[in-house]
Interface confidence: low
């Protein structure tokens, strides 16, 4: 039996600035109950704090809310595990909340084919930004990305929209039905996960770009 | 709903120890947020004193770390303020409250303190 | 410690009123501020915190605004229940700190 080993914290999210998770993983237990808490302060101050909710995001996290989170404060946490036999503590962890954020993938993407009498067709789609961000209040620049395939195909092709919410592809294979997905970014931050697959069926008589 | 309600003696004499208690009802003290304890000085000036949170750790104003202490019972729920040495200065209606992550959504009525020979 | 001053110390206004409260701070505290309200025989009440972000069951005439230094309580429309004391406090920086108040009394 022996103390605890070293925990880590690996990871800290956020998806909108306003609210955060951080999660660590265990070190050995020692063959023996251990207990974990996180512990913080933020730069500049002294006075440490515990996690205000290990609940929220799943075992071994510490979820700050809205209460608890300052967009312009670097917060410098710290994990202890403690058995009968001792205690260890994980590395401290800075954390800048306006560098972590993974927004929730993009919403209402929809696609359609386009076949102007007078152009070539293409393909439009369009979706809206994640719903927990508010990017009336500048704090926010979101960058978006797409992929599409054919449905049996295995490799995707990535276009980068930049702050488009639309965007056009003029070059599809006729009679196919594709795969269209969309993710973004903050641009300061991590991606968000692609958005549900949408689907849409390429005419047979669509023209391919030349 | 959250109540708390403070208690002390009411009259101390300069040196001395101030007592105070919070018992809070509708809530287990145990169970998340910080307590805290505030005054108010006769002038109605506001000063944060420090908190004891739900897993017992405490956070300290730094103009009375030297002389504060906050412990907590949770059998009775209620949580206790120990200052040391006091003065005149230490006059004043203490408020105990709940932090609602760095603001206050719940306040007791306040107890009234006087320190005098 | 973040010094914050209150003003005006006072202020008469009738019912149905637009008033306008402020702080100011002796830093840039960002959005991190607070706002209660102080009655005879009541328990204080949070009405608004981080500048803007009402309290819940706070009634929607009470809002705030304001970041960096300056910030401002607004009550849209008085009504007799709002004659009261009213303080601020920053929540960015420890220790906590709170304004002189501003007593709002009927005209």
């Known amino acids: 039996q022996l103390p605890p080993g070293k925990p880590e914290i690996f990871k800290c999210r956020s998806p909108n600035k306003e609210t955060f998770t951080c999660w660590w993983r265990p070190g050995t237990d020692g063959g023996l109950p251990t207990n974990y808490s996180l512990t913080y302060h933020r730069e500049g101050e002294t006075l440490m704090h515990e996690c205000p909710d290990y609940i929220t995001g799943g075992p071994n996290s510490c979820h700050f809310g809205k209460q608890y989170t300052s967009m312009w404060r670097t917060y410098v946490m710290m994990v202890n595990a403690t058995n009968q036999m001792g205690s260890s503590f994980s590395d401290e962890l800075y954390v800048d909340v306006t560098y972590i954020v993974q927004p929730d993938p993009p919403l209402e993407l929809t696609v359609e084919v386009k076949q102007p009498e007078d152009r070539k067709p293409y393909l439009w789609m369009k979706w809206s930004p994640p719903t927990l961000i508010d990017l009336k209040t500048g704090w926010f620049t979101l960058l978006y990305e797409i992929r599409l395939k054919p449905e049996k195909a295995a490799e995707w092709e990535t276009h980068f929209a930049g702050q488009q919410t639309e965007f056009k592809i003029l070059s599809l294979h006729p009679g196919q039905k594709y795969l269209v997905q969309v993710r973004c970014k903050p641009d300061h931050g991590y991606w968000s996960a692609w958005s549900p697959a949408t689907f849409i069926q390429i005419p047979s008589d669509f023209i391919m770009n030349d | 709903q959250v109540q708390l309600q403070e208690s002390g003696p009411g009259l101390v004499k300069p040196s001395q120890t101030l007592s105070l208690t919070c018992t809070v009802s509708?809530?287990?003290?145990?169970?998340?947020?910080?307590w805290n304890w505030i005054r108010q000085f006769p002038g109605k000036g506001l000063e944060w004193m420090g908190y004891?949170?739900?897993?017992?750790?405490?956070s300290y104003n730094p103009s009375l770390k030297s002389r504060i202490t906050i412990s907590r019972d949770t059998s009775k729920n209620q949580f206790s303020l120990q200052l040391n040495s006091v003065t005149a200065a230490d006059t004043a209606v203490y408020f105990c409250?709940?932090?609602?992550?760095?603001?206050?959504?719940?306040w007791g009525q306040g107890t009234t303190l006087t320190v005098s020979s | 410690d973040v010094q914050i001053t209150q003003s005006p110390s006072s202020l008469s206004a009738s019912p149905g009123d637009r008033i306008t409260l402020t702080c100011r701070a002796s830093k840039n505290i960002y959005k991190y501020l607070a706002w209660y309200q102080e009655k005879p025989g009541k328990t204080n009440n949070l009405l608004i915190y981080s500048g803007s972000t009402l309290h819940s069951g706070i009634p929607s005439r009470f809002s705030g605004s304001g970041s960096g230094t300056d910030f401002t309580l607004t009550i849209s429309s008085l009504q007799p229940e709002d004659f009261a004391m009213y303080y601020c406090?920053?929540?960015?920086?420890?220790?906590?700190?709170f304004g002189q108040g501003t007593k709002l009394e009927i005209k």
């Open positions: 004891i949170s739900y897993s017992g750790s405490t």
């Open positions: 509708g809530y287990s003290i145990t169970s998340d947020y910080a």
């Open positions: 409250a709940r932090d609602y992550g760095y603001v206050f959504d719940y």
């Open positions: 406090q920053q929540h960015n920086d420890y220790p906590y700190t």
